[in-house]
Every structure is written in C-alpha cells, then in structure tokens.
C-alpha cells in the first residue's frame, strides 16, 4: 500500500500542477492539471530526467514535501536517470509555461538516477485535477 494515505490527510491550501510523461505526451500544457496538495506536501515539484529502458526524456509534476525535493534517490521512483528536481513554494508555480522562467521561491537539485517514493506520487491521483 501507499506510504502515505494521502486521501486521509487534510488539504493544505496549496495547489500544484500534476502530470507524468514528457513535454508532448502526458505533460503538455493541455494534459497538466491543478491538484489540491495534502498534509505535509506543501511544495510544487518538477522533476525531469531520462526514463529507462530507452533513455527517453521523462517528467513528473506534482505536490511534494521539502524532503522529497531534496531526495537524492527520487529518480528511482520513476526509473529516471540524471534527474533534475525543481521545487517552488507558491500555488501553481510548477506550471509548464514557467519552466523556462524563474520560478518563485524555487530550488533545484541535480541527481544521477537512482528508493521507493513512487507510492507517494501514485497516491497523487491525476483525477484530483481541478
């Protein structure tokens, strides 16, 4: 089961954009929806990297805890290598159109691949979108 039963945690007022895929399939602007963050997941995340087995570009957006934003093994959750994690502290700040702009209150971490955070992200159901 999931590490966090997110549905049982209270909404915390933060809204972040959520998606999994790449910039054209799964994480395009049209496929990226706002979700309500819950519990301690009070930052908005963008994680980019390459995805096994074909080394294709891959991206994840969603809500995250501060520790997830700094997690050296975040890439393992999605079989991602050369992962770059960017988190920010305003609702909606991980909008796709802001990727090339400064993202307010953001901080970045760069890691090489690969511990078990996938359950947390799986619990951020895209169906929760606004």
């Amino acid at each position: 089961g999931p590490i966090l039963e997110l549905e049982n945690l209270p909404q915390n007022g933060r809204q972040c954009y959520s998606c999994k895929g790449n910039s054209t399939h799964g994480c395009s602007s049209e496929e990226t929806f706002l979700i309500d963050c819950r519990g301690p997941m009070n930052q908005c995340l963008v994680a980019t990297g390459t995805h096994e087995p074909k080394n294709q570009s891959y991206m994840v957006r969603g809500c995250a805890t501060a520790s997830m934003c700094q997690h050296a093994h975040l890439g393992d959750a999605f079989s991602m290598n050369h992962i770059d994690v960017s988190c920010c502290t305003k609702s909606g700040c991980n909008h796709p159109d802001l990727d090339v702009q400064y993202r307010g209150g953001s901080h970045h971490h760069h890691h090489h691949g690969g511990s078990g955070l996938n359950d947390i992200f799986e619990a951020q159901k895209i169906e929760w979108h606004e």
Epitope: P10, Q11, N12, G13, R14, Q15, S29, E30, L34, N42, C88, T89, K90, S91, G92, C93, H95, D97, L98, Q101, R103, G104, G105, E130
Partner: antibody, heavy 118, light 107 residues
Framework: EVQLQQSGAELVRPGASVKLSCTAS????????INWVKQRPEQGLEWIGW????????EYASKFQGKATITADTSSNTAYLQLSSLTSEDTAVYYC???????????WGQGTLVTVSA | QIVLTQSPAIMSASPGEKVTMTCSAS?????MHWYQQKSGTSPKRWLY???KLASGVPARFSGSGSGTSYSLTISSMEAEDAATYYC??????????FGGGTKLEIK
C-alpha cells in the same frame, strides 16, 4: 477547509480612509498571492492589486496607485487593504482572493461592502 | 494594460440550448480564466488555463481559444447556469484584468 474571512461592512465619510482585513484559514497566506478585487454596485470586477506575503512585494493596477495600499501580517495570517481619500466612486464590495502563480484565483472571501456617504 | 471585451453583455437561453460567450483581448494573452457569479455572492472559480474545469464544475462547460480570442461554451443550458460569467486574462505580468461580464439568463 480553505477559507478567506473578510471584515464587516463599513460606512465612511468622504475624504476618510478605511482598512479592510482578510484572514485565511486552512492555508498559509505565504503560499499564495493575496489579491484584492473591487466590484461597484451592478458592475463588473476590477483587479486592484496583490501582495506576496512572503516578502511584502506588491503590484497595483495603475488606476489604484495612491488609492489602495495592500499589506499583510503573516503572524496572524491576515492581509489588509487600505483605501484613502474616499469618494462615492469607492462605494463597492471589495473581495480578497488567493491567487496562484498564473493569475488564477481559486479562493474568494465573502466580500466587504464599503459605503462612502456624508 | 490589456482590455478584455466580453460579448454579448446579456443573453438568454432555453433549457437544453447550446450557449457560447466570447472574450476578446486587446493584445495576445497566455491564458484566460473564467469565473461564475450569482447575484449577492462572491465569484466562483469556473475554468482556468483557458480550457480546464475547476472542481465541481459540470462537464457541459468547456473553454477554448488562444491569442486574443477566447470563448466559454455550455453544451446544454440548465437553469442553475444562469449567472454572470467573467473572463480574466493571464499574461506574464499583472495587471490581471477582467472582462465586463456576460449575464446569462434562462428563458
């Protein structure tokens, strides 16, 4: 539950000032941009400006420069709108809203009616 | 400052009728957001990022557009849809101007 609770209605004299409050519950105001929006009787919505409570940065619509001052107190999770040199044109309902990074206002207070009358 | 013009200002529709209202911007904007307001109440979030429905908004609502031309459509009018709808633009910087509103009445 996310809520924005605004202060009560105000009846003020022309030339006076008034300070409205907007208190958030269910979220930290530092997570949002707190916006203020004006609606005159039977009229549309006008964006006054916003504050980033995290650092005190503000932005105003040009027509409200000098008329409106937006402040925030993060310790009480409250934002304020002060209106100065009031005239009948300032008679309106004023809404506070929680706005996100792309100008979307998902959270709205119930509004405060300000009536300027001698 | 970007000016938004909504049309028509007032319209009426019968139950089951398709409804389309438009919002025209004086210069290109990135996205259009929409709000619904009923008399005596605060505006409610309705659509964001041009085409995405806010939580609780019925699927009969849709939004589309780009550049300077945007629209909100109701595929089949219902009595509860009678309200005033405001568009509001987002480009990279404030001010976040609103349109003048379209008042939708039920026939």
């Amino acid at each position: 539950e996310v809520q924005l609770q605004q202060s009560g209605a105000e009846l003020v004299r022309p030339g006076a000032s008034v300070k409205l409050s907007c208190t958030a519950s269910g979220f930290n105001i530092k997570d949002e941009y707190i916006n203020w929006v004006k609606q005159r009787p039977e009229q549309g919505l006008e964006w006054i400006g916003w504050i980033d409570p995290e650092n005190g940065d503000t932005e105003y619509a040009s027509k409200f420069q000098g008329k409106a001052t937006i402040t925030a107190d993060t310790s009480s999770n409250t934002a304020y709108l002060q209106l100065s040199s009031l005239t009948s044109e300032d008679t309106a309902v004023y809404y506070c809203t929680g706005g996100n990074y792309v100008g979307w206002f998902p959270y709205w207070g119930q509004g405060t009616l300000v009536t300027v009358s001698a | 400052q970007i000016v938004l013009t909504q049309s028509p200002a007032i319209m009426s529709a019968s139950p089951g009728e398709k409804v389309t209202m438009t919002c025209s911007a004086s210069s290109s904007v990135s996205y259009m957001h929409w709000y619904q307001q009923k008399s005596g109440t605060s505006p409610k979030r309705w659509l964001y990022d041009t085409s995405k429905l806010a939580s609780g908004v019925p699927a009969r609502f849709s939004g589309s557009g780009s550049g300077t031309s945007y629209s909100l459509t109701i595929s089949s009018m219902e009595a509860e849809d009678a309200a005033t709808y405001y568009c509001q633009q987002w480009s990279s910087n404030p001010p976040y101007t609103f349109g003048g509103g379209t008042k939708l009445e039920i026939k």
